[in-house]
């Protein structure tokens, strides 16, 4: 139990259209040492939505960020969702590794889902 | 300092809606998530659902799912809860609550509670 | 869903008695839970979050601990006020609350 552990808090979500979408996140550690990273789906096909360590991803800002929260908390938000943004959002914890980073744990991940603009 | 009052108490029928509402004071409104939590007469208390105020993100308990809207209005402070096709069991004290800071998902201060009673 | 027993239901004690109120949940949580105090005509209070940490402004006579799916809360001496219901809270995977377990005078 003193592993750590991937904490995603709500199954799902439901944002309307041109709103941002707040995903939430929690490590129960910081070891061991690696990066998170968030996807859009499971298995090969998933998509990179976020890389704590490189890459430039302008419609994700990382929570921590703006409300200074602590640093176990991998909490994402992005902005200007569409319906396209729709699916299974997952944050994986990766361990270090050499040459490249292995995957670790993933938490159950949060379903996103978009609701019409309000007229 | 933290306030969450709540609108009044409400006699609905089966089948109608009702709307309560839990007007936030004291605090940075969009910076804390805002839950709502049931308790039906000597029952236990029931999460419901959640809502960003800032983004107006939801997300709901499996049971309530289609039957519960969660809105907020930034320009009061004030979030609603909706739950329509009322029956009987709906009966019950809702209560909102606000989320506590940093990572911390509970649940650290509650509006007074509003008293729905679903009676034909 | 995650469920949340609670056990005792209900506990007789007396002021200056040593009380433990258990929960279990169906899967392992951490330490994401609470724990929160509850009085008739009254909306529930915040004691104990993270299984371990005292809100603020609680008595100190309140501890809570465990971790994975057993949790514990004591109240070391129980005093005239705290008679009242205890609920525990997990905050792992949406949100769900134990039984609840009333503590009444002997």
């Known amino acids: 139990e003193d592993e750590l552990q991937v904490i995603q808090p709500e199954k799902s979500v439901s944002v309307a259209a041109g709103e941002s979408a707040t995903l939430r996140c929690a490590m129960t550690s910081l070891i061991p040492v690696g990066p998170i990273m968030w996807f859009r789906g499971a298995g090969a096909g998933r998509e990179l939505i976020y890389n704590q360590k490189e890459g430039h991803f302008p419609r994700v800002t990382t929570v921590s960020e703006l409300t200074k929260r602590n640093n176990l908390d991998f909490s994402i938000s992005i902005s200007n969702i569409t319906p396209a943004d729709a699916g299974t959002y997952y944050c994986v914890k990766f361990r270090k590794g050499s040459p490249d980073d292995v995957e670790f744990k993933s938490g159950a991940g949060t379903e996103l889902s978009v609701r019409a603009k309000p007229s | 300092q933290v306030q969450l009052v709540q609108s009044g108490a409400e006699v609905k029928k089966p089948g109608a809606s009702v709307k309560v509402s839990c007007k936030a004071s004291g605090y940075t409104f969009t910076s804390y998530y805002m839950h709502w939590v049931r308790q039906a007469p000597g029952q236990g208390l029931e999460w419901m659902g959640i809502i960003n105020p800032s983004g107006g993100s939801t997300s709901y308990a499996q049971k309530f799912q289609g039957r519960v809207t969660m809105t907020r209005d930034t320009s009061t402070s004030t979030v609603y809860m909706e739950l329509s096709s009322l029956r009987s069991e709906d009966t019950a004290v809702y209560y909102c609550a606000r989320e506590g800071p940093e990572q911390l998902w509970y649940l650290d201060y509650w509006g007074q509670g509003t008293l729905v009673t679903v009676s034909s | 869903d995650i469920q949340m027993t609670q056990s005792p239901s209900s506990v007789s004690a007396s002021v200056g008695d040593r009380v433990t109120i258990t929960c279990r949940a169906s899967q392992g949580i951490s330490s994401w839970l609470a724990w929160y105090q509850q009085k008739p005509g009254k909306a529930p209070k915040l004691l104990i979050y993270?299984?371990?940490s005292l809100q603020s402004g609680v008595p100190s006579r309140f501890s809570g601990s465990g971790s994975g799916t057993d949790f514990t809360l004591t109240i070391s001496s129980l005093q005239p006020e705290d008679f009242a219901t205890y609920y525990c809270?997990?905050?792992?995977?949406?949100?769900?609350f134990g039984g609840g377990t009333k503590v009444e005078i002997k």
């Open positions: 993270a299984a371990s």
């Open positions: 809270q997990q905050a792992f995977s949406h949100r769900t």
